[in-house]
Interface confidence: low
């Protein structure tokens, strides 16, 4: 999906307003020095693109992302601020639900969403300063 | 209104320095980058670098690392450029460019830079 | 550091024709791409960004479009306030570089 058509604005409030909140408490009980940050991204698009991915692409140790509550809200605020994503997204929320049965967190997925953190903080201040 | 309003024309003596100002008004001027571009008489644009106004963490490239020194005053929401070692070469229109995600939706009216004897 | 070649470097055209400038970059810089126009004693404006979208209050004769590395900017019917230079730049990275503009003239 081109993400170059969002509306970045409308998603970064719904970020601030409640996503950033969600990760907060997926995260409660973890330090923040715990995981080191090794995704990034260059602008918003970018940053979208590799938010998507973590967010919802199963991963090997982490497979349980998709029905947080985070990842439930991301999905809502890429469909309503992003022309066209949901139609791009049906064989993929397939899928998630085979993937998908029961909520279990793992160190993996910690760490998944320590990455999420990082690129959602990046989405808010985008321009990379080194490539 | 965005602004972006540059200091007025400098003409120095070659090994010289001159400090060329950018101020920004209408928006947060923390919230972008301050990028700086050089364009020669006759020539195309060069990018410089850029500053982070938040954190004033700058980033040049290697053709200007001893030449540009880039610097903000957030109490005046000011980005400024300084040139030193002046050489015939440095002979330009200098601009300030504003960017979120690295194009420039809002430029200074540019500052031009003459070096001669 | 990514090139950016632009072509032509110059062009002589009429009011009403469709004029169209293309830039390739050394490499995939996916949408991240923009266009400026610079008249004479003037700062860039610009154009379009992200390759294909307009910048506010940019008539709608203007368009960007993208294949791969290859990307064209396209005035549909040039007007007489269209006659400037032309620059491309990609925003993908650090560090940012421009193509060596194009001049459109009038025939």
């Known amino acids: 999906y081109d993400f170059t058509n969002c509306d970045f604005e409308k998603i970064k409030a719904a970020y601030l307003s409640t996503i950033s909140k969600d990760l907060i408490t997926y995260m409660s009980g973890t330090k923040s020095t715990e995981f080191n940050n090794t995704v990034s991204c260059s602008n918003r698009p970018h940053c979208l693109t590799e938010i998507q991915s973590l967010t919802f692409n199963p991963t090997a140790g982490c497979a349980s992302l998709a029905k947080e509550m985070f990842a439930m809200k991301t999905k809502a605020a890429l469909a309503i601020w992003c022309p066209g994503y949901s139609e791009t997204q049906i064989n993929a929320t397939q899928a998630m639900k085979k993937a998908r049965k029961s909520k279990v967190t793992t160190n993996k997925c910690l760490e998944q969403v320590s990455q999420l953190q990082g690129l959602w903080r990046r989405f808010n201040r985008p321009l990379l300063k080194q490539q | 209104e965005v602004q972006l309003v540059q200091s007025g024309a400098e003409v120095k003596k070659p090994g010289a320095s001159v400090k060329v100002s950018c101020k920004a008004s209408g928006y947060t001027f923390t919230t972008y980058w301050m990028h700086w571009v050089k364009q020669a008489p006759g020539q195309g644009l060069e990018w410089i670098g850029m500053i982070d106004p938040s954190d004033s963490e700058t980033t040049l490239i290697q053709k200007f690392k001893d030449k540009a020194t880039l610097t903000v005053d957030k109490s005046t929401s000011t980005a400024y450029m300084e040139l030193s070692s002046l050489r015939s070469e440095d002979t330009a229109v200098y601009y300030c460019?504003?960017?979120?995600?690295?194009?420039?939706?809002?430029w200074g009216q540019g500052t031009t830079v003459t070096v001669s004897s | 550091d990514i090139q950016m070649t632009q072509s032509p470097s110059s062009l002589s055209a009429s009011v009403g024709d469709r004029v169209t400038i293309t830039c390739r970059a050394s490499?995939?810089?996916?949408?991240?791409l923009a266009w400026y126009q610079q008249k004479p004693g003037k700062a860039p404006k610009l154009l379009v960004y992200?390759?294909?979208t307009l910048a506010e209050g940019v008539p709608s004769r203007f368009s960007g479009s993208v294949s791969g590395t290859d990307f064209t900017l396209t005035i549909s019917s040039l007007q007489p306030e269209d006659f400037a230079t032309y620059y491309c730049q990609h925003h993908y990275g650090t560090p940012w570089t421009f193509g060596g503009g194009t001049k459109v003239e009038i025939k």
């Open positions: 490499e995939n810089i996916y949408s991240y």
């Open positions: 460019a504003r960017t979120l995600d690295g194009y420039y939706d809002y």
């Open positions: 992200f390759a294909k």
